[in-house]
């Protein structure tokens, strides 16, 4: 699971340390890359590769860093305007409607289909029916069921492009 | 089932202002950043402010920044979107919406983003 530690978890020490720049907020409102003092005067510049914040805002904190899990790859660091970006590795992915954690792609399609799309890292292989071409639900099939694209090997690795 | 029902929008002229009000059936509510996004005729959706969990700090879009404001009652689990100086470019219908994740810490994306209402309309023109 990505680090569920939030700034408030810190000391207040820890969150604003005496060397960070400072400036003026805007109506209010601190640039993306800073957060706002706590007497609303000063906007402090985030700590590259520890905390963010990626738009306008009047947080008394930066937001921390999120840590790709295991089986995860980043793909980007966090900077002060933008946190992580982590990808599923090769031959698992994490779809939108389950966010929480990378799941192993279907090695094949069952009996009766054929495979028309690749494993990626947002999908998992896509099956079809043969004859009518409509899509299979999803279900993991029985092992003696699954077709292979050949003997023991992955129908198809993942792709981290893209 | 979470439901999101906002509320508010209507026609109005350009520095006028609007409240709108999005109330959540969900009990998760009081503990997740909610967002206010907006989608203007033809343009995709495009993120306007998120809120923290506990009401205290908050993301703008810098096309709204100072002049629309964000808050949220966790106790009557509303959130709410004061527009004020509106712009002929504020026309769209705004959604308010819930992250995918309940341990997002502010989310600003649309992707990020699972459980949306219905949205409601808000024109300005002279």
């Known amino acids: 699971e990505s680090a569920l530690i939030t700034q408030q978890d810190l000391a207040p020490q820890q969150r604003a340390a005496p060397q960070q720049k400072r400036s003026s907020p805007s109506e209010g409102l601190c640039p993306p890359g800073h957060h706002i003092s706590e007497d609303g005067r000063d906007c402090i510049s985030c700590k590259y590769g520890q905390d963010y914040s990626t738009h306008w805002n009047d947080l008394l904190f930066c937001l921390r860093c999120t840590r790709c899990d295991s089986g995860e790859v980043e793909l980007s660091p966090c900077t002060t305007t933008r946190n992580t970006v982590c990808q599923c590795e090769e031959g698992t992915f994490r779809e939108e409607d389950s966010p929480e954690m990378c799941r192993k792609c279907r090695t094949g399609c069952p009996r009766g289909m054929v495979k028309v799309g690749d494993c990626t890292p947002w999908s998992d292989i896509e099956c079809v029916h043969k004859e009518s071409g409509t899509k299979h639900s999803g279900e993991v099939p029985a092992v003696e069921e699954t077709v292979t694209s050949s003997p023991g090997t992955p129908a198809s690795p993942c792709s981290l492009s893209g | 089932e979470v439901q999101l029902l906002e509320s508010g929008g209507g026609e109005v002229q350009p520095g006028g202002s609007l409240r709108l009000s999005c109330a959540a059936s969900?009990?998760?509510?009081?503990?997740?950043?909610v967002g206010w996004f907006r989608q203007a005729p033809g343009k995709e959706r495009e993120f306007v402010s998120a809120?923290?969990?506990?009401?205290?700090?908050?993301y703008y879009a810098e096309s709204v920044k100072g002049r629309f404001t964000i808050s949220k009652d966790n106790a009557k689990r509303t959130l709410y979107l004061q527009m004020s100086s509106l712009r002929a470019e504020d026309t769209a219908v705004y959604y308010c919406?819930?992250?995918?994740?309940?341990?997002?810490?502010?989310?600003?994306?649309?992707?990020?983003?699972?459980?949306w209402g219905q949205g409601t309309l808000v024109t300005v023109k002279p």
């Open positions: 919406a819930l992250p995918r994740r309940g341990d997002a810490e502010l989310p600003s994306t649309v992707k990020e983003y699972g459980y």
């Open positions: 969900v009990s998760t509510f009081g503990t997740s950043p």
């Open positions: 809120i923290r969990w506990e009401g205290v700090g908050a």
